[in-house]
Interface confidence: low
């Protein structure tokens, strides 16, 4: 009986501490529980901001091409350069100079080259209005970009394109030969033949930046 | 000995259950050590991706007022119009316009009014030679917006300031009383005084638009 | 004051080319156009053409277009008019004045075109 | 080119008496015209410029009126130095021409 009261209370002692165990892995099974559930959300919340991040990277990227493309536009329009260099006229898609000083054909040709420009050329009746209007305040000659060898020869512009016959008549030295050849300048609005040597005004022309008008 | 057999029995069983129960509190334990672990992972990527979204945020935030910026250079670029309109010459801070009608000096003003500018007026010895420069190939007179009522009276721009006395000498009529008031023309380089009521050619001269040059 | 002297009278063959000068004092030479006039004996005022000789443009009448030449020394002052393939009806006295209205004038110089 | 014609082209006339000389354009010249007296073997000599302002130093007996095309030029009281011939010029637009002059003789 002895052996049998150590038993028993043996007994007692597992049964207690199996209770104890099984109230233990209850705790433990609950605590398990909520730690996956916790886990469960964690794995959310990263699933959430790796998504957030993910479309932030993208409209990051998109944000940083809009940027380069603006910085881009901004780059070919800030320095937006004028039409025309100053003292220059701007009419349609050219600039006009009129020369304040006064040199042969060839002399007046360099002058415009040097200014990035050519010698006047009338492509259209437009044109020769626009010029005719703005010497009108002139009584002097301007030379153009017209010249000829000699008479039997056809007017040429500096380009090497022929003159529109329909344009303008050429009076004055028409069938006159030069050493130097014969060169076209306008005068009070109509156009004249003489001789390249001689010195008159001029008027240089090139083409009008309007890229960012 | 038949209960001591069945207790040591029990004993055995409970000692059993106890050690599995040992068992599965040790693998728990671990599980949860190895949960926790993961847990800790988990909230550590979950601080690196919310800092990253947040560096991310700002980083955007920057973009878009960067972009914003851009957006409001390139309006105010953009459409950066010409110094000055077609057929107006551009120099220094002014556009000038030389008219290609014949009109009194009251007209002319109206005229220069009427495309939103005045008549020529000289501020600096600067101003009065580019004017020299590109009216040398006429002959004829330009108004300017110089005028005086009579000999008595100072010579007044129309903005109501006087003439700086050193900028040049005005010839011609000066000491002449007209019922229409003496204005002053420039030809050839040189100002005269001359009855209003006459015809001449004028210079405007407006504010060129310089914002975006 | 004000001065223009020109170059003394000339006789020449018809063809020939005749070149009168006009030297002025008194004033900026380049400020003012410098024009040319002509009167046939007993005959009115004709106008040949001008130089502004700060530029050296000039203007001519298409009269005298290929044949008129108007050029300027402006370290001297002096503005030239030469007429080439002289005719008799050429005949004239020639006249530099300065400026519009021309205020000043030179005395002439007369020109006689004979064979 | 504008055409300018003078009249007369002579006028006989007496020291104190009152002379007007005339001269039409082709068209209208906006006062830009001016009148020269010649004396025989001179050069001419500036009277009137832009149709009626008087050049310095000349007499103020010499004036000048007109617009548009028609222009006068009105001597108020001869004097014997004024027997010449004079000329009216348009300089509004080149060839600046002259009118073909009209002598004034003493009576």
């Known amino acids: 009986s002895q052996v049998s009261n150590l038993l028993k209370q043996q007994q007692t002692n597992l049964t207690h501490q199996k209770n104890k165990l099984e109230g233990q892995i209850s705790a433990r099974q609950q605590a398990e529980e909520a730690s996956q559930e916790s886990q469960n959300e964690l794995k959310e919340m990263i699933e959430t901001l790796a998504w957030k991040l993910n479309e932030k990277s993208k409209e990051q990227m998109e944000l940083h091409h809009q940027n380069l493309n603006l910085q881009e536009t901004l780059k070919r329009v800030a320095n937006c350069s004028a039409p025309c260099p100053q003292d220059w006229i701007w009419h349609e898609e050219n600039c006009y100079l009129f020369s304040t000083g006064s040199f042969n054909w060839e002399k007046s040709q360099e002058k415009c080259l040097s200014l990035d420009a050519k010698l006047l050329k009338i492509n259209s009746t437009a044109d020769l209005d626009f010029i005719q209007q703005a010497i009108s305040y002139s009584s002097f000659p301007f030379w153009m970009g017209l010249s000829r060898r000699n008479p039997s020869y056809p007017w040429l512009w500096e380009d090497g394109s022929p003159l529109m016959p329909h344009l303008f008549r050429i009076r004055g030295a028409v069938s006159q030969t030069y050493p130097s050849g014969t060169c076209a300048y306008i005068q009070r609005g109509a156009v004249y033949a003489e001789n390249c040597i001689l010195a008159a005004f001029s008027i240089c022309q090139k083409k009008a930046n309007l890229r960012a008008q | 000995s038949q209960v001591s057999n069945l207790l040591k029995q029990q004993q055995t069983n409970l000692t059993h259950q106890k050690n599995k129960l040992e068992g599965q509190i040790s693998a728990r334990q671990q599980a949860e050590e190895a949960s926790q672990e993961s847990q800790n992972e988990l909230k550590e990527m979950i601080e690196t991706l919310a800092w990253k979204l947040n560096e991310k945020s700002k980083e955007q935030m920057e973009l878009h007022h960067q972009n914003l910026n851009l957006q409001e250079t390139l309006k105010r670029v953009a459409n950066c119009s010409a110094p000055c309109p077609q057929d107006w010459i551009w120099h220094e801070e002014n556009c000038y316009l030389f008219s290609t009608g014949s009109f009194n000096w009251e007209k002319s003003q109206e005229k220069c009014l009427s495309l939103d500018a005045k008549l020529l007026k000289i501020n600096s010895t600067a101003d009065l030679d580019f004017i020299q420069q590109a009216i040398s190939y006429s002959s004829f007179p330009f108004w300017m917006g110089l005028s005086r009522r009579n000999p008595s009276y100072p010579w007044l721009w129309e903005d109501g300031s006087p003439l700086m006395p050193h900028l040049f000498r005005i010839r011609g009529a000066v000491s002449q009383t007209y019922p229409s008031g003496t204005c002053a023309y420039i030809q050839r380089g040189a100002v005269y005084a001359e009855n209003c009521i006459l015809a001449a050619f004028s210079i405007c001269q407006k504010k060129a638009n310089l914002r975006a040059q | 004051q004000v001065q223009l002297v020109q170059s003394g009278a000339e006789v020449k063959k018809p063809g020939a080319s005749v070149k009168v000068s006009c030297k002025a004092s008194g004033y900026t030479f380049t400020d003012y156009e410098v024009h040319w006039v002509r009167q046939a004996p007993g005959q009115g005022l004709e106008w040949m053409g001008a130089i502004h000789p700060g530029s050296g443009g000039a203007a001519y009448v298409q009269k005298f277009q290929g044949r008129v030449t108007m050029t300027r020394d402006t370290s001297t002052s002096t503005a030239y008019m030469e007429l080439s393939s002289l005719r008799s009806d050429d005949t004239a006295v020639y006249y530099c004045?300065?400026?519009?209205?021309?205020?000043?004038w030179g005395q002439g110089t007369l020109v006689t075109v004979s064979s | 080119d504008i055409q300018m014609t003078q009249s007369p082209s002579s006028v006989s006339a007496s020291v104190g008496d009152r002379v007007t000389i005339t001269c039409r354009a082709s068209?209208?010249?906006?006062?830009?015209l001016v009148w020269y007296q010649q004396k025989p073997g001179k050069a001419p000599k500036l009277l009137i410029y832009?149709?009626?302002s008087l050049q310095s130093g000349v007499p103020s007996r010499f004036s000048g009126s007109g617009s548009g095309a028609d222009y006068t030029l009105t001597i108020s009281s001869l004097q014997p130095e004024d027997f010449a011939t004079y000329y009216c010029q348009q300089y509004l637009i080149t060839p600046y021409t002259f009118g073909q002059g009209t002598k004034l003789e003493i009576k």
């Open positions: 068209q209208g010249i906006n006062n830009w």
């Open positions: 004045a300065r400026w519009l209205p021309m205020d000043y």
């Open positions: 832009a149709a009626s």
